[in-house]
């Protein structure tokens, strides 16, 4: 889970080990602060739960692409 004790920096120390259905996801943001031990993605679910995920994993990248597509119509 994200740790925001020393706000405003939020860090992820562990990643989810299960793929989350894109239907459960509402948004995402990147964690890239040098104060954090890992580069991470935090997904926010439709019930406002925040989940840390590994940006190197393909399902994480595909999920971010899916969320982008929902907010913008692509012109391929």
């Amino acid at each position: 889970q994200p740790d925001a004790i020393n706000a405003p920096v939020t860090c992820c120390y562990n990643f989810t080990n299960r793929k989350i259905s894109v239907q459960r996801l509402a948004s995402y943001r990147r964690i890239t602060s040098s104060k954090c031990p890992k580069e991470a993605v935090i997904f926010k679910t439709i019930v406002a739960k925040e989940i840390c995920a590994d940006p190197k994993q393909k399902w994480v990248q595909d999920s971010m692409d899916h969320l982008d597509k929902q907010t913008q119509t692509p012109k391929t």
Partner: nanobody, 123 residues
Amino acid sequence: EVQLVESGGGLVQAGDSLRLSCAASGRTFSSYRMGWFRQAPGKEREFVAAISRSGASAYYADSVKGRFTSSRDNAKNTVYLQMNKLKPEDTAVYYCAASSRIGVDDPEAYGYWSQGTQVTVSS
């Protein structure tokens, strides 16, 4: 941390083509949506194009649709903007950027920016 180095700008005639390149450092290039923005003198920075992490989807501003094409090579950590049929109104400093959150055409959704490259289109 991502660093972006852009190249390919210059002075061209109306109707000509240019290709901008943006090389990224870092091991997770394929995890960033990449965007292109431009800023003309006295104007706000505006969205030009963006490309998804996989490269399968591209997004364009109405003003460049059908003339500009964005692509990426994740093996080379590089994103490209092919600009055809350039117009004087395309004159601006062009920036590439790497996303930090949702919001394809929102400059605030991009956390990393290149230094910018000047594109000048003369009539």
